[in-house]
C-alpha cells in the first residue's frame, strides 16, 4: 500500500494530517491489483499539490475519486485518461485556482463537486458555470471565484465578455447515398473563444478524410460501404466553456444480398432460415421446384429479427410432408438489384418408403399457390388462421 | 535541529483571557501540521486541535469546539492557543506537537493554573 | 468521535514481552500511533503508521494493528521502559487518544 495511505482489495485512503502524502498514491509493485481498484479517498493532506497526467491511470476501475481538505493546486490535463469509469469526483476545499475540462469531457461523471476551491474569475472556468446551469439540480454546488480586486463573486454570477458556447452548423446535401459512391460534408463552427473544429465519425468504415481550416471543415467520404448505413456523422465545436455539435445520419442504398439461407431445421415449426441484406428494404420472393410460392397461412415468411438493413427470418411451413421435398429458391430485389440462393430441402420421405430412399423430389403444384410476391415482413392475411407457436419478431421493429 | 518551544507557565482567574503560544525551528514551520494536547492532573492525553500553518486550516476536536482558539503567525513560525474565558477546569498542561514524521517533536508544555 | 480501549495497566519482568493492546470499531482501517510519557516529561512518539519506528528509538518496540485492535510489543522490556504509553488514531481530522496504560516493570 502507498506510504500512509490505507488500502483493501479495491479502495485506497489516506486521510492522516501527518505524515501525511507529497504525492498522489501509487500501488507498489506486486501488491494490490491498481485495476480493481474503485475508489481512492484523499483527505487532510495539504502537501499534496498536483496529479500528474501518469498518476491515476494504473486504476483503470476507478469510479469515485475523493481529494478533500487538501493542498491540491493542479491536475494535468490527460490526468484521467485511462480512468473511462469515473462515476464521481470530489474536489472539496482544495487550492485550484483553474481547472480545464478537458480532464473530464472524455468522462460520463454523475458528480463532480469543486466547493471551496479559490478559482480565479476568468473564461478557464466559465465551463464550470455551464455544467451548473445544465443541471439545475436543487443541490447545486455554492462555488465562489475571486476577481482582479480579489473580490469573491458567485459563480452564477460570473460575466465574461467573448466567452460563450461555440456552434456548430452542418450543411449536408441528402445524406442518402448509394453504396460505392462518394459524398462531402461542410461545417462550420462559430463562437468566442474560437472554437476547435474535429469530426466523429464514431466506427466508419468506409474510407474517409477530412480538411479542416479554423471554422470551417469538411469531410470527404469515398467508395461508401454499405455497413455504414445508419450511421452518426458529427461536426464538434469545441473551446474553453463547452461543446456544440451537429449531426446527420448516412442512409446507403445497396442491392440485396442472401448472406445466409440453410437446410429446414425443426422447433415449433419447420423453418428455412436466411438471412438477407439490403436497403430500401427488399421485397422477397420465395420459388418452389422454379415455380411461385404463394405463401398461405401454413407455409409463410417469417421476420425475426431486424437490424438496419439486415433481415433475420424463415420460411415457416407447417406440418411439411415428403409432399413439400424440394428444391426452395429465395429471390431478394430491389431498385438497385437483386440476389438469389437455393437449397434443397428433405423433411420427410415417401409413405412406406424408407426415409431418404427416393432422390427424386415429387414434381407437386400447390393447391392454392399463386404468384403474389412478398415484401420483408409478415403479410399473411391472419384473420381467419388459429393462434400460431412461432417466434415472430416482437420488438415492434418494422420488418 | 527540529524543535517547538512553548511560551512559560501562566497563573490565571477563571474569566480571564489567555494565549499561549508555540514556536517552531529547524524546519519548514508552514509545511506540517501543529497540534495542541491537553493533559489535566493526573490524567491522560487529549487532543485539542490541529492548525495548518500555510492556510490557516484549523481543526478542532468536538470537546473544544468554540471552547479555544488556534491560531498562527507563519511571519515568526508561531502557533497559538487562546480563551476569551479561562475556567478552573481548564487547570492543565498543555502541549504542542509537530514535526514531518508524524508527531514526533513535542515542545515542553505550558502549565496553565486557572484558580480564584 | 470513536474512542480507544486501553488497560489501565500492565506489569512486566525485566526482559519479559510487554503487549499493550488498544482497541476501537474497525480500528485496523486506521494509522495507529503509539506515544511514551514518563513522569514530568514531555511525551515521546515510539510508533507510528502502525509499525514504523522513529529515528532513535530501539528496535525492542514494534507495533501491530487488524481487525479492531492495535498492539505496542515491547520485546525484552527494560526497567527504562517504565512510562505511561498512550495508542493514538485519527477520526476523520481530529486526534484521538487511548485513555493510557501505565507499564510497569518489576
Known amino acids: 500500500c502507498p506510504t500512509s495511505c490505507k488500502c483493501s482489495a479495491s479502495r485506497i485512503w489516506c486521510s492522516d494530517p501527518s505524515p501525511g502524502i507529497v504525492a498522489f498514491p501509487r500501488l507498489e509493485p506486486n501488491s494490490v491489483d491498481p485495476e480493481n481498484i474503485t475508489e481512492i479517498f484523499i483527505a487532510n493532506q495539504k502537501r499534496l499539490e498536483i496529479i500528474n497526467e501518469d498518476d491515476v491511470e494504473a486504476y483503470v476501475g476507478l469510479r469515485n475519486l475523493t481529494i478533500v481538505d487538501s493542498g491540491l493546486k493542479f491536475v494535468a490535463h490527460k490526468a484521467f485518461l485511462k480512468n473511462s469509469n469515473l462515476q464521481h469526483i470530489n474536489f472539496t476545499r482544495n487550492k485550484l485556482t483553474s481547472l480545464s475540462r478537458k480532464h473530464f469531457r472524455h468522462l460520463d461523471l454523475s458528480e463532480l463537486i469543486l466547493v471551496g476551491n479559490p478559482f480565479t474569475c476568468s473564461c478557464d472556468i466559465m465551463w464550470i458555470k455551464t455544467l451548473q446551469e445544465a443541471k439545475s439540480s436543487p443541490d447545486t454546488q455554492d462555488l465562489y471565484c475571486l476577481n482582479e480586486s480579489s473580490k469573491n463573486i458567485p459563480l452564477a454570477n460570473l460575466q465574461i465578455p467573448n466567452c460563450g458556447l461555440p456552434s456548430a452548423n452542418l450543411a449536408a446535401p441528402n445524406l442518402t447515398v448509394e453504396e460505392g459512391k462518394s459524398i462531402t460534408l461542410s461545417c462550420s463552427v462559430a463562437g468566442d473563444p474560437v472554437p476547435n473544429m474535429y469530426w466523429d465519425v464514431g466506427n466508419l468504415v468506409s474510407k474517409h478524410m477530412n480538411e479542416t481550416s479554423h471554422t470551417q471543415g469538411s469531410l470527404r467520404i469515398t467508395n461508401i460501404s454499405s455497413d455504414d448505413s445508419g450511421k452518426q456523422i458529427s461536426c464538434v465545436a469545441e473551446n474553453l466553456v463547452g461543446e456544440d455539435q451537429d449531426s446527420v445520419n448516412l442512409t446507403v442504398h445497396f442491392a440485396p444480398t442472401i448472406t445466409f439461407l440453410e437446410s429446414p431445421t425443426s422447433d415449433h415449426h419447420w423453418c428455412i432460415p436466411f438471412t438477407v441484406k439490403g436497403n430500401p428494404k427488399p421485397a422477397l420472393q420465395w420459388f418452389y421446384n422454379g415455380a411461385i410460392l404463394n405463401e398461405s397461412k401454413y407455409i409463410c415468411t417469417k421476420i425475426h429479427v431486424t437490424n438496419h438493413t439486415e433481415y433475420h427470418g424463415c420460411l415457416q411451413l407447417d406440418n411439411p410432408t415428403h409432399m413439400n421435398n424440394g428444391d426452395y429458391t429465395l429471390i431478394a430485389k430491389n431498385e438497385y438489384g437483386k440476389d438469389e440462393k437455393q437449397i434443397s430441402a428433405h423433411f420427410m420421405g415417401w409413405p412406406g418408403i424408407d426415409d431418404g430412399a427416393n432422390p427424386n423430389y415429387p414434381d407437386v403444384i400447390y393447391e392454392d399457390y399463386g404468384t403474389a410476391a412478398n415484401d420483408i415482413g409478415d403479410t399473411t392475411n391472419r384473420s381467419n388462421e388459429i393462434p400460431s407457436t412461432d417466434v415472430t419478431d416482437k420488438t415492434g421493429r418494422e420488418h | 535541529q527540529v524543535q517547538l518551544l512553548q511560551s512559560a507557565a501562566e497563573v490565571k482567574k477563571p474569566g480571564e483571557s489567555l494565549k499561549i503560544s508555540c514556536k517552531g525551528s529547524?524546519?519548514?514551520?508552514?509545511?506540517?501540521?501543529i497540534g495542541w494536547v491537553r493533559q489535566m492532573p493526573g490524567k491522560g492525553l487529549e487532543w485539542v486541535g490541529i492548525i495548518y500553518p500555510d492556510d490557516s486550516d484549523t481543526r478542532y476536536s468536538p470537546s473544544f469546539q468554540g471552547q479555544v482558539t488556534i491560531s498562527a503567525d507563519t511571519s515568526i513560525s508561531t502557533t497559538y492557543l487562546q480563551w476569551s474565558s479561562l475556567k478552573a477546569s481548564d487547570t492543565a498542561i498543555y502541549y504542542c506537537?509537530?514535526?514531518?514524521?508524524?508527531?514526533?517533536?513535542w515542545g515542553q508544555g505550558t502549565t496553565v493554573t486557572v484558580s480564584s | 468521535q470513536s474512542v480507544l480501549t486501553q488497560p489501565p495497566s500492565l506489569s512486566v519482568s525485566p526482559r519479559q514481552t510487554a503487549s499493550i493492546t488498544c482497541s476501537g470499531d474497525?480500528?485496523?482501517?486506521?494509522?495507529v500511533s503509539w506515544y511514551q510519557q514518563k513522569p514530568g516529561q514531555s511525551p515521546v512518539l515510539v510508533i507510528y503508521?502502525?509499525?514504523k519506528r522513529p529515528s532513535g528509538i530501539p528496535e525492542r518496540f514494534s507495533g501491530s494493528n487488524s481487525g479492531n485492535t492495535a498492539t505496542l510489543t515491547i520485546s525484552g522490556t527494560q526497567a527504562m521502559d517504565e512510562a505511561d504509553y498512550y495508542c493514538?488514531?485519527?477520526?476523520?481530522?481530529?486526534?484521538?487518544f487511548g485513555g493510557g496504560t501505565k507499564l510497569t516493570v518489576l
Open positions: 506537537a509537530s514535526g514531518e514524521v508524524a508527531f514526533d517533536v
Open positions: 529547524g524546519y519548514r514551520f508552514t509545511s506540517y501540521w
Open positions: 503508521q502502525d509499525t
Open positions: 474497525k480500528l485496523g482501517d486506521k494509522f
Open positions: 493514538q488514531a485519527w477520526d476523520s481530522s481530529t486526534g484521538v
